[in-house]
């Protein structure tokens, strides 16, 4: 069967029907359907005016305008808001009421596209394998990235979050139109990786999506990840404004000027340096979502009541931090180079700057405890990777899972850890699953391009597609049309259970309490440390005028250290795109092509791409109860400060409303709220906060949409902000 022309709100569209073998099965493929009008720079997306006749939807459209990997030119287009649909068809009747899976790509909110990199004429985000193997409709789409998607003055002049609003427009378009393609508009699952996983999470929390989303999967990225929310957007907006010659003294004039500036100039005004970094690499990603008081009405930690009816899977890769650690400390991947205690201490101190000497020393001690027993370079390098994995991915994911569970009504929660090792031939043997390694298996690459893969890779891919599509159908990854290798138990606050995804899966794959000591450290011990003063927190200013070196952070406001965005001649951005591709220069509009397999290693065609999404991680405590973030009563306003902040601030460390603290022991006691920068143990909230939007337990009647005025709503930091 085949669909033929389909009538949508924009008009008729016609795709391609691709036959799948001799049994008569096929897949209808639609590429390049507009879901919004061509964009205007730094404006919200608008509905598409439609067309007459039948739109031939047979080719991917260009990605949204973005810098190339080398950051010296742009590719893509401002006219980029298009989506792609794969609809599986049986032999006789056209499909009806199929579950719908909408993919959101990663790329550090800086790069990427709905189709991903092209390798052997197969695009990374080609939905055919998922659609046909799982009998679901797959949708991918483009959204604006970089300054054009996320530049903000932190006020009404340029509220930001344009890329998130693009994503919402695509989701709403699917809801309104997918029935015509044979989809069930009441069974939409979002899934995404890295910045895409965080976007999935943010979309479930936004009041704009009420009633649109049934289920969600965050792979290596959640809303609470420390790189997701920009707390000082004005700093970054001014950096770009200065570069393109716009006035910076008055936000309204600056905004007007930026809106009429050549979008290519805006895009190239922001560069991510990659060498001579004063701070860890991810602190240089400046154009990301903001708390705008509208689309994201409050700190994400306070919005989980909005996701109370959405089934949720979240997980991380066991070495998600590897690519970032190898950028921050290049010796990690070099057999002939050593990681020293001094190197690691420096890295730790850069992440823990607002806790001063004590923060650095305590963290260093916790992570190097094993070094006395095993001083091998392999162990030391693994420690560095574990450290970045914990901070950027595992801990925030754990908190997100606990928060979802605590607020869920009928919704289910599942956690996973993806551990199938990276197939990058240039990596040391000890490297596990790097950031973005999971994508190729979810999208069925071992089946689509079999020559690059081994049977065990097909086993992993088959299992992941089965779990993911079963979940999309039923809300339970074990139940659906696809057989699974073992039973995946839900995550609960009692069991802290997670499924470890590997090539051999059985009953022992269901595990509990991942990295307990480290989760406890970050959510209890570290947070209780006092925040140091500005002088103590400020490092010695860098010398020289290279724009690659960030201004030293000042103050203890709620932002990560913000480096400059200059055109420093810094090396190109790491492969953080949607492609899962190594740093090979991009070709055409396809994204950087992945390194082909070399020798007999069977290296996969899609290596990791460091697009920085933080995957959710199951609870790691052996405490029984995972950390349920409190909702606090800090009274911080829902809109970030819009003042002329000057140099980039240091991220806060607990004097502004601290991140959640997991209960200890098996007491089942409620979570305690940290109380500022005192050295005493945090005390439980007293409940006089004026009804925070997200209660610590899921049975509350809290309104799903938090206030957007300047009320005293709780504003907890999204995660440990270092």
């Amino acid at each position: 069967a085949k669909l033929g022309a389909v009538y949508t709100e924009g008009g008729f569209v016609e795709g391609v029907n691709k036959k799948l073998g001799l049994l008569g099965d096929s897949v209808d493929i639609f590429k390049g359907i507009p879901f919004a009008a061509p964009t205007k720079a730094l404006e919200n997306p608008q509905p598409h005016p439609g067309w007459q006749g039948t739109l031939k939807a047979k080719n991917f459209k260009k990605r949204c305008l973005q810098a190339t990997i080398t950051q010296d030119s742009t590719y893509g287009d401002e006219d980029c808001l298009y989506l792609n649909i794969w609809v599986p068809q049986g032999r006789k009747q056209v499909s009806r009421d199929l579950p719908v899976m909408i993919w959101i790509y990663g790329g550090a909110f800086l790069m990427g596209s709905g189709h991903g990199a092209n390798f052997l004429n197969n695009y990374l985000y080609d939905g055919e394998e998922i659609a046909t193997r799982g009998n679901v409709i797959v949708v991918t789409f483009n959204y604006r990235v970089g300054p054009l998607g996320f530049l903000s003055t932190g006020d009404a002049n340029l509220p930001g979050n344009y890329g998130l609003r693009d994503q919402h427009m695509a989701i709403a378009w699917v809801k309104r139109n997918i029935a015509a393609f044979g989809g069930d508009p009441n069974n939409i699952t979002l899934f995404g990786e890295s910045a895409g996983g965080a976007s999935v999470s943010l979309q479930t929390l936004s009041p704009y999506n009420k009633g649109l989303i049934r289920r969600a999967i965050s792979q290596s990225g959640v809303a609470l990840s420390p790189w997701v929310i920009q707390k000082n957007p004005l700093f970054w907006a001014k950096k770009v404004a200065e570069k393109v010659g716009c006035p910076v003294g008055d936000a309204a004039r600056m905004a007007q000027c930026l809106k009429v500036t050549d979008p290519r100039a805006l895009t190239l005004a922001y560069k991510v340096p990659l060498a001579g970094l004063e701070y860890p690499m991810l602190h240089y990603v400046g154009f990301v979502p903001v708390i705008d008081g509208d689309f994201i009405p409050a700190d994400p930690i306070n919005l989980y009541a909005n996701a109370a009816d959405i089934d949720y899977i979240a997980g991380t890769n066991n070495m998600d931090g590897h690519i970032f650690a190898s950028i921050d400390m290049p010796a990690i991947n070099k057999g002939n180079k050593k990681v020293t205690e001094e190197d690691f201490y420096k890295l730790v101190s850069e992440f823990t700057i607002t806790k001063g000497l004590r923060g650095a020393k305590t963290t260093f001690d916790v992570y190097t405890e094993s070094w006395a027993q095993d001083p091998s370079q392999e162990n030391k390098k693994k420690t560095v990777v574990d450290f970045e994995t914990d901070v950027l991915f595992l801990v925030p994911t754990e908190i997100a899972l606990a928060q979802h569970r605590a607020n869920a009504k009928s919704a289910k929660t599942y956690a996973y850890l993806f551990s199938h090792p990276s197939r990058m031939p240039v990596y040391p043997k000890w490297v596990g699953a790097d950031h973005a390694d999971d994508i190729q298996y979810v999208f069925g690459k071992p089946f689509a391009t079999p020559t690059g893969y081994r049977p065990q890779d097909r086993t992993v891919s088959k299992a992941m597609i089965a779990y993911w599509t079963n979940f999309a159908k039923t809300g339970d990854p074990n139940m659906g049309d696809s057989a699974v290798p073992t039973h995946w138990e839900p995550y609960t606050t009692e069991n802290s259970g997670y499924l470890e995804i590997t090539k051999k899966m059985g009953s022992s794959s269901m595990k509990r309490s991942l990295r307990t000591n480290f989760l406890r450290y970050w959510t209890l011990t570290y947070l209780a440390l006092p925040t140091v003063t500005d002088q103590e927190a400020t490092p010695v200013p860098p010398t020289g005028d290279s724009e690659a070196t960030p201004v030293p952070p000042t103050g203890d406001s709620e932002t990560a250290p913000v480096p400059p965005t200059g055109d420093s001649g810094a090396p190109p951005v790491p492969p953080t795109g949607d492609s899962g591709a190594p740093p090979v220069p991009p070709t055409g509009d396809s994204g950087a092509p992945p390194v082909p397999p070399t020798g007999d290693s069977g290296a996969p065609p899609v290596p990791p791409t460091g697009d920085s999404g933080a995957p959710p991680v199951p609870p790691t405590g052996d405490s029984g109860a995972p950390p349920v973030p409190p909702t606090g009563d800090s009274g911080a306003p829902p809109v970030p400060p819009t003042g002329d902040a000057g140099p980039p601030p240091v991220p806060p460390t607990g004097d502004s409303g601290a991140p959640p603290v997991p209960p200890t022991g098996d007491s089942g006691a409620p979570p305690v709220t940290p109380t500022g920068d005192s050295e005493t143990a945090p005390v439980p909230p007293t409940g006089d906060s004026g009804a925070p939007p997200v209660p610590p337990t899921g049975d509350s009647e809290a309104a799903p949409v938090p206030p957007t005025d300047d009320s005293k709503e709780a504003q907890m930091p999204a995660v440990i902000r270092f």
Epitope: E9, F12, P47, P49, Q52, R176, A179, L212
Partner: antibody
Framework: QVQLVQSGAEVKKPGASVKVSCKAS????????MHWVRQAPGQGLEWMGV????????SYAQKFKGRVTMTRDTSTSTVYMELSSLRSEDTAVYYC????????????WGQGTLVTVSS | DIQMTQSPSSLSASVGDRVTITCRAS?????MHWYQQKPGKAPKLLIY???KLPSGVPSRFSGSGSGTDFTLTISSLQPEDFATYYC????????FGQGTKLEIK
């Protein structure tokens, strides 16, 4: 100027079929979709379906699938709507209506054709 | 399908009055359109894309809204404005509101 002229009133028995025509003039016939909307006596408007005159592609409201067929004749710039298995509740005024532009509203309407279904 | 709920279903007003009719969609929509229909006549396009007026429609008619809530306003009723008004959304399965009958008080 744009004109849509529909065929005259029809009286049909239950179980029969009716075919209503809509002749377009004043614009390029193949450049705009044509919709059919009906209105039962004293009731509101109900969308039935749409046809793209350039390639004959159609889409029908779920309620009418299997009973309605829309066709066009480009040589005479005419679209047709045939409704089969008529029942008394199909008694209504049937309108053809042309898109205004893009995915726009229905900017131009025929005068309507009353179809009465009675035994 | 997307449901459209118009209110009120009928209303009485006098010449010169300001009148407002609302239409709520069961989910967020891209565009809302409004039609005027007089007895025995075909509907006539009044407002398109929420707030735009086709040529020939008097400026006393205006439309506003986005997402799920939309409004048609007649700033100063004229005798020829007494009619039935329909809202209309264009998803892949277009639907109309049930109509608002505007009568002379």
């Amino acid at each position: 100027q744009v004109q849509l002229v529909q065929s005259g009133a029809e009286v049909k028995k239950p179980g029969a079929s009716v075919k209503v025509s809509c002749k377009a003039s004043g614009y390029t016939f193949t450049s705009y979709n044509m919709h059919w909307v009906r209105q039962a006596p004293g009731q509101g408007l109900e969308w039935m379906g749409v046809i793209n005159p350039s390639d004959g592609a159609t889409s029908y409201a779920q309620k009418f699938k299997g009973r309605v067929t829309m066709t066009r004749d480009t040589s005479t710039s005419t679209v047709y709507m045939e409704l089969s298995s008529l029942r008394s509740e199909d008694t209504a005024v049937y309108y053809c209506a042309r898109d205004y532009y893009g995915s726009s509203p229905l900017g131009y309407w025929g005068q309507g054709t009353l179809v009465t279904v009675s035994s | 399908d997307i449901q459209m709920t118009q209110s009120p279903s009928s209303l009485s007003a006098s010449v010169g009055d300001r009148v407002t009719i609302t239409c709520r969609a069961s989910q967020s929509i891209s565009y809302m359109h409004w039609y005027q229909q007089k007895p025995g006549k075909a509907p006539k396009l009044l407002i398109y894309a929420a707030s735009k007026l086709p040529s020939g429609v008097p400026s006393r008619f205006s439309g506003s809204g986005s997402g799920t809530d939309f409004t048609l306003t007649i700033s100063s009723l004229q005798p020829e404005d007494f009619a039935t008004y329909y809202c209309h959304q264009r998803s892949s399965s277009p639907t109309f509101g049930q109509g608002t009958k505007l009568e002379i008080k």
